[in-house]
Amino acid sequence: GSQHIRAEKAMVDGSWLDLAKRSKLEAQPFAHLTINATDIPSGSHKVSLSSWYHDRGWAKISNMTFSNGKLIVNQDGFYYLYANICFRHHETSGDLATEYLQLMVYVTKTSIKIPSSHTLMKGGSTKYWSGNSEFHFYSINVGGFFKLRSGEEISIEVSNPSLLDPDQDATYFGAFKVRDID
Amino acid sequence: GSQHIRAEKAMVDGSWLDLAKRSKLEAQPFAHLTINATDIPSGSHKVSLSSWYHDRGWAKISNMTFSNGKLIVNQDGFYYLYANICFRHHETSGDLATEYLQLMVYVTKTSIKIPSSHTLMKGGSTKYWSGNSEFHFYSINVGGFFKLRSGEEISIEVSNPSLLDPDQDATYFGAFKVRDID
Amino acid sequence: GSQHIRAEKAMVDGSWLDLAKRSKLEAQPFAHLTINATDIPSGSHKVSLSSWYHDRGWAKISNMTFSNGKLIVNQDGFYYLYANICFRHHETSGDLATEYLQLMVYVTKTSIKIPSSHTLMKGGSTKYWSGNSEFHFYSINVGGFFKLRSGEEISIEVSNPSLLDPDQDATYFGAFKVRDID
């Protein structure tokens, strides 16, 4: 009796261990989205970046959705959000309209239920990109830990989008779930 | 009968809880490597930094390997990778040969199976460090979420390595596993 | 007999699954603290920032303690720590005392048992904020993976605190536990 139960228990527990491990370690949502440079807006004003790759090169997504330029949360939780935004200019691209630039990024959260948009994180710098130098570059990195609810949307706004570096290692943002909400 | 089984089950579950918790929370790979300043290359060109501490001060490693200047992945998974690189110059450290600097970091992944190296993340800035100022400083931070396979190697390349800040709180990189691959 | 035991086991395992999931995913400590601008020190010297929100807007804390301007660890573990610090100046705020600035952040760990304070991470930049521009902005981001013991305290020091951006999306720091200590 008790030997049979022990064996059966070990078997059930074994499969449960697999299931638990899978459910914990594999179902955790994440995304790493890289800039799609074929559709970067021009201008120096602040714009929302809507074109991102989610399934090529380093870009990937799981248990989250990318739609209409926004990263949509499918699972309540606490997430670590991050963004890396690179700006660059070479003199061969033409003269800058101004040497005084505000190079900024804003990571925003939009709630559909209560139509509102809020900035979670911002970063950047004012720069003086003089014509004396043939090449200019600047990167911003921001990151933070936030409570996100299913249906909420994360988007990226930048100033001077025409100066964005289009490489996948340069301009990207992402998120990964760290823990459930109590 | 059933009381005995319940007691036995509680005992087995208790140890399983310990085991599961240990296997989940302790076996997760990580590394935090700090610059070893005794062997920083000179020059202004882009170089791979090969000297890092892994077991002193804030530096530590577990279930990953550090070898030949590279952080080697031992366990498939999705990892959060990060780097913080500080550059500095004091007038007593010698005269700058140029005021126009590109201070950059590149976090690269090398696959041994398919010998190839790819940049996962880059960051930095062009800077104008005038001789009029006695001290200059600049830090770069990058971070992102990447799928890494066992045997793949992470390394750090920087421009102007002779300007690196050798403090352990200044120049470091690291990784920690967040979840398994589906 | 054995059918009854199986049903009972499934029921116990079910609740255990909930318990395990909760204990793992919900008990993990975290904090995201945003600057309390009502009490920012003046001056250009390096100071410890002691006023942070922990329960309004994006600010939150769980299984950690905020006291006397310090984030106190309640649970041993490996944590990812991060900080985002924004500095800004508008000409309407008056002239800067100097155009040459060191804008820096230091994330420090204090151990009560062995009274000592150590810098875990630093970042920043020297800046030339010329009077030719009406607005200046600069952000720093640092992050890293550290072993923290119960009772240890994390605090933030900055230079030029009077230039801090008081927005919750601009100046914040945080931590979340990633794994236990072996």
Partner: antibody, heavy 122, light 108 residues
Framework: EVQLLESGGGLVQPGGSLRLSCAAS????????MSWVRQAPGKGLEWVSG????????YYADSVKGRFTISRDNSKNTLYLQMNSLRAEDTAVYYC???????????????WGQGTLVTVSS | EIVLTQSPGTLSLSPGERATLSCRAS???????LAWYQQKPGQAPRLLIY???SRATGIPDRFSGSGSGTDFTLTISRLEPEDFAVFYC?????????FGQGTKVEIK
């Protein structure tokens, strides 16, 4: 081939002024930091002054600070050293030398010009 | 500022012999940032070694440099007649760039 040719040396009285020139050829002049190094008769070498490729930053030995001014004209591929308030101890052969351009810090000197003699005497 | 002391002041050797010249710094030279030059009478100095041990272009392999920290050495494995001259070390790890006072290698 890199060539550096100094000129402008000569005899000058204490308190007087002199301007040295160094004509450069064989390399992209504006891309390299340049320096002046001097050698008093029968003595060793002393670095005097340096300038970045753009000319935006200049550096001086304490012994000449406030009296000497280094400059360059990148359009003419020429380096200058304006020497004012000259003293007897400034008597030396003055060499112009090119920075290697391989490090971000001004480093060794290679190559050197043939030098021009400055004599400060009454 | 760093002081570089060269020894000996004069080295009297015959062609074919090995020459060992020392350069000692008053404090550690950052990053092995040290160079060696050769100067013959009436000529400008010529770069031999940079980075403590890297030979400059066109310099014969009988010239070698070594050392780090505060102690550096220039070695000429077999002296040729054209090698007799004054040799200077120079540090560039800190400002200002400083030369040693020189070592004269003369024919015995």
């Amino acid at each position: 081939e890199v060539q550096l040719l100094e000129s402008g040396g000569g005899l000058v009285q204490p308190g007087g002024s002199l301007r040295l020139s160094c004509a450069a050829s064989g390399f992209t002049f504006s891309s390299y930091a340049m320096s002046w190094v001097r050698q008093a008769p029968g003595k060793g070498l002393e670095w005097v002054s340096g300038i970045t490729g753009s000319g935006g930053s200049t550096y001086y030995a304490d012994s000449v600070k406030g009296r000497f001014t280094i400059s360059r004209d990148n359009s003419k591929n020429t380096l200058y050293l304006q020497m004012n308030s000259l003293r007897a101890e400034d008597t030396a052969v003055y060499y112009c030398a090119k920075d290697p351009g391989t490090t971000v810090i001004m480093s060794w000197f290679d190559p050197w010009g043939q030098g021009t003699l400055v004599t400060v005497s009454s | 500022e760093i002081v570089l002391t060269q020894s000996p002041g004069t080295l009297s050797l015959s062609p074919g012999e090995r020459a060992t010249l020392s350069c000692r710094a008053s404090q550690s030279v950052r990053g092995r940032y040290l160079a060696w030059y050769q100067q013959k009478p009436g000529q400008a100095p010529r770069l031999l070694i940079y980075g403590a041990s890297s030979r400059a272009t066109g310099i014969p392999d009988r010239f070698s440099g070594s050392g780090s920290g505060t102690d550096f050495t220039l070695t000429i494995s077999r002296l040729e007649p054209e090698d007799f001259a004054v040799f200077y070390c120079q540090q560039y790890g800190s400002s200002p760039r400083i030369f040693g006072q020189g070592t004269k290698v003369e024919i015995k």
